[in-house]
Interface confidence: low
């Protein structure tokens, strides 16, 4: 069983996972050094944040926060078109409330069990956890 | 080989209860989201419910909400639907679904299918 | 939810010949989060595009997936007589998945 945990968690972090680093400023922020190389269906995820070269970390990203706050954020290309197109979308999805002023940090426990921290100027749109569907 | 095989179909009168069963073999079981999917005699695909890997996020269509309730035993590589308050529309044949890229995405592997038939 | 309008309901077609599947969403859905099924009577389902235009694995090349927003189509270059069938489309943008009404595909 922990074996099968194991094995699912790495297949997790190789397909969508983000190698991070800590940020200049010593913890911070948690930096995405390489780019989700699949599309990030949007059904997974519920909002998503900027990361800024300026704030310290080596390249510009999209980090998509997943639904599930056990799964550890998506880093994605902003200059790809899918990585637009989501971000749109979820611009375009009504948050449930309204956003909190500023950003509160996310702390909730990523897949490798680092703490995910969110970094100021975060972009927070809440995706709705009860659509119409299911 | 990668494989689901349903099981727990049958006839059951309206207002009765079922517990499908969905075994897998030939894959990481605990690494997949997996999904019911339910097919009317004679009409199209109707999703019903998904679970994540680890069975700690749930969701279901409308039609089925409140009645039926999907789980799954990662130690025993199955997944169930426990039907309750069976109604004549939920006459149909039930597939499991296994997610293509483990965190909510298309169905790559199907089984081949549970009738269950409800009727006085 | 997104509710997906496939057309023609039928399509009446000889071997060799090109057949255009169309699938129409009722909202935006990502153009990563769009799927194609083929389904023979008496069998389940089988995945033939997935993200709108990647074939799955042992799919033939004849088989291919275009489109974004809220069109999407489904090409099948030349038809084989195996590929006689109903065929849906599937989005999983929403958290809720739902399936097109289906296109049958028959022979003329």
């Known amino acids: 069983m922990a074996q099968s945990l194991a094995l699912s968690l790495l297949i997790l972090v190789l397909a969508f996972g983000i190698p991070r680093t800590q940020g200049s400023d010593g913890g911070a922020q948690d930096c995405c050094l390489k780019y989700s190389q699949r599309k990030i269906p949007a059904k997974v995820v519920r909002s998503y944040r900027k990361q800024e070269p300026s704030l310290g970390c080596s390249i510009p990203a999209i980090l998509f926060l997943p639904r599930k706050r056990s799964q550890a954020e998506l880093c994605a290309d902003p200059k790809e078109l899918w990585v637009q197109q989501l971000m749109q979308h979820l611009d375009k999805t009504p948050s449930p409330q309204k956003p909190a002023q500023g950003c509160r940090k996310d702390r909730g426990a990523s897949k490798t069990g680092k703490k995910g921290k969110g970094s100021k100027g975060c972009k927070r749109t809440e995706r709705s956890q009860t659509p119409k569907g299911p | 080989e990668v494989q689901l095989l349903e099981s727990g179909g049958g006839l059951v009168q309206p207002g009765g209860s079922l517990r499908l069963s969905c075994a897998a073999s030939?894959?990481?079981?605990?690494?997949?989201?997996l999904n019911w999917v339910r097919q009317a005699p004679g009409k199209g695909l109707e999703w019903v419910s998904y679970?994540?890997?680890?069975?700690?996020?749930?969701s279901y269509a409308d039609s089925v909400k409140g009645r039926f309730t999907i789980s799954r035993d990662n130690s025993k590589n199955t997944l169930y639907l426990q039907m309750n308050s069976l109604r004549a529309e939920d006459t149909a044949v039930y597939y499991c679904?296994?997610?293509?890229?483990?965190?909510?995405?298309?169905?790559?592997?199907w089984g081949q299918g549970t009738l269950v038939t409800v009727s006085s | 939810e997104i509710v997906l309008t496939q057309s023609p309901a039928t399509l009446s077609l000889s071997p060799g010949e090109r057949a255009t599947l169309s699938c129409r969403a009722s909202?935006?859905?990502?153009?990563?989060?769009l799927a194609w099924y083929q389904q023979k009577p008496g069998q389940a389902p089988r995945l033939l595009i997935y993200?709108?235009?990647n074939r799955a694995t042992g799919i033939p090349a004849r088989f291919s997936g275009s489109g974004s927003g809220t069109d999407f189509t489904l090409t099948i270059s030349s038809l084989e007589p195996e590929d006689f069938a109903v065929y849906y489309c599937?989005?999983?943008?929403?958290?809720?998945?739902?399936f097109g009404q289906g296109t049958k595909v028959e022979i003329k």
């Open positions: 679970i994540s890997n680890q069975g700690d996020d749930t």
């Open positions: 030939g894959f990481t079981f605990s690494s997949y989201w």
């Open positions: 599937q989005q999983y943008d929403d958290l809720s998945y739902t």
């Open positions: 679904a296994r997610d293509y890229q483990y965190i909510g995405d298309s169905f790559d592997i």
């Open positions: 909202q935006y859905v990502s153009y990563v989060s």
């Open positions: 993200d709108a235009s």
